[in-house]
């Protein structure tokens, strides 16, 4: 499993380092999750040829995975801190059902998949503390999520492999874009 935030093995030893600010903690948390995604992607890519597949668009149409767009206020053109923060939190909440789907999809990285899921919950909490306009954040409907989960789990093996690959790739891209935007705040 990856090293938990605050014990990052890549940090240079700094005995007198100041306690992390909330921004640094969020930054570190995202890096930690990205680390976990990387390990999960390794297993996925080793297990199937999905990572090279050009048929992704087929499956992608059936998944409504969160994606950053210019209207979300996270790009430098039209950057809006509050709108962007709402988009990041909403996007992460929408990803939660897909992260739940990933839980039974890994053999050697089962612990890693759980760590990604739990760390994302912690990240959402960090970001909610930072957000001023919590009313603008729409929480996904649990019933809709439950039926989506059932539908995804009922797919054939090939589609399940494709779905796993697409979730990991999209989540990685969403986090990278979020990290970039959060650093501008």
């Amino acid at each position: 499993a990856p090293v938990p935030p605050g014990e990052d093995s890549k940090d240079v030893a700094a005995p007198h380092r100041q306690p992390l600010t909330s921004s640094e903690r969020i930054d570190k948390q995202i890096r930690y999750i990205l680390d976990g995604i990387s390990a999960l992607r390794k297993e996925t890519c080793n297990k199937s040829n999905m990572c090279e597949s050009s048929k992704e668009a087929l499956a992608e149409n059936n998944l409504n995975l969160p994606k950053m767009a210019e209207k979300d206020g996270c790009f430098q053109s039209g950057f809006n801190e509050e709108t962007c923060l709402v988009k990041i939190i909403t996007g992460l909440l929408e990803f939660e059902v897909y992260l739940e789907y990933l839980q039974n999809r890994f053999e050697s990285s089962e612990e890693q998949a759980r760590a990604v899921q739990m760390s994302t919950k912690v990240l959402i909490q960090f970001l909610q503390k930072k957000a001023k306009n919590l009313d603008a954040i729409t929480t996904p409907d649990p019933t809709t999520n439950a039926s989506l989960l059932t539908k995804l789990q009922a797919q054939n093996q090939w589609l399940q492999d494709m779905t796993t690959h697409l979730i990991l790739r999209s989540f990685k891209e969403f986090l990278q874009s979020s990290l970039r935007a959060l650093r501008q705040m």
């Epitope: 890549k10 940090d11 240079v12 600010t21 640094e24 930054d27 995202i30 890096r31 990205l34 680390d35 995604i37 990387s38 950053m68 210019e70 996270c74 790009f75 430098q76 053109s77 790739r169 990685k172 891209e173 986090l175 990278q176 874009s177 990290l179 970039r180 650093r183 501008q184």
Partner: antibody, heavy 124, light 107 residues
Framework: QVKLEESGPGILQPSQTLSLTCSFS??????????VSWIRQPSGKGLEWLAH???????HYNPSLKSRLTISKDTSTNQVFLKITSVDTADTATYFC????????????????WGQGTSVTVSS | DILLTQSPKFLLVSAGDRVTITCKAS??????VSWYQQKPGQSPKLLIY???NRYTGVPDRFTGSGYGTDFTFTISTVQAEDLAVYFC?????????FGSGTKLEIK
């Protein structure tokens, strides 16, 4: 292997618009984590970052020049463009484009490949 | 903007010497600092990324360290071919600023 090549007008007059092209090969700007930056260097001076375009079309500019800069990309032809309006003699420099790529699994970038640069002189 | 203060501006050293260049950021940039080498008439080349990671093919005499606001770049045993200008650069937040450069000259 990765290669980048800048092209520009060489010489232009004050108040004109400078159009630069960065043609690259060996990577795709539709790949997540990829991007291209423009950097300039007046003769004998330091490096000044101008603009960056990410794979997801997010564009970042140097605030001191933002009103004069426009960066764009053509993913199908592997090219990135930079336009600088209302040039002045202070814009005389060598202009570099560089691939700014994601390293490791985090949101950490580095300019790992650079073009040879194209020399631009603004003179009346 | 994040300002990077690089020092010294010039270094005159003999082959075999150890040299250290420092780069101080005006605010925390985590470990998002790269170091570049620019030889006369050439474009810059990446040496170190993520503060301490040596780029592919870079000799191990080049090292980097640091976190937050204070970064160090070291050449353990300077060689004649190390004659160049060295720049630090932060990739934490745009605008992605560069240090002013350190010109290394060999006696």
């Amino acid at each position: 292997q990765v290669k980048l090549e800048e092209s520009g007008p060489g010489i232009l007059q004050p108040s004109q618009t400078l159009s630069l092209t960065c043609s690259f090969s060996g990577f795709s700007l539709s790949t997540s984590g990829m991007g291209v930056s423009w950097i300039r260097q007046p003769s004998g001076k330091g490096l000044e970052w101008l603009a960056h375009i990410y794979w997801d079309d997010d564009k970042h500019y140097n605030p001191s020049l933002k009103s004069r800069l426009t960066i764009s990309k053509d993913t199908s032809t592997n090219q990135v463009f930079l336009k600088i309006t209302s040039v002045d003699t202070a814009d005389t420099a060598t202009y570099f484009c560089a691939r700014r790529s994601l390293y490791g699994n985090w949101g950490d970038y580095a300019m790992d490949y650079w073009g040879q640069g194209t020399s631009v002189t603004v003179s009346s | 903007d994040i300002l990077l203060t690089q020092s010294p501006k010039f270094l005159l050293v003999s082959a075999g010497d150890r040299v250290t260049i420092t780069c101080k950021a005006s605010q925390s940039v985590s470990t998002d600092v790269s170091w570049y080498q620019q030889k006369p008439g050439q474009s810059p080349k990446l040496l170190i990324y993520y503060a301490s990671n040596r780029y592919t093919g870079v000799p191990d005499r080049f090292t980097g360290s640091g976190y937050g606001t204070d970064f160090t770049f070291t050449i353990s045993t300077v060689q004649a071919e190390d004659l160049a200008v060295y720049f630090c650069q932060q990739d934490y937040r745009s605008p992605f600023t560069f240090g002013s450069g350190t010109k290394l000259e060999i006696k």
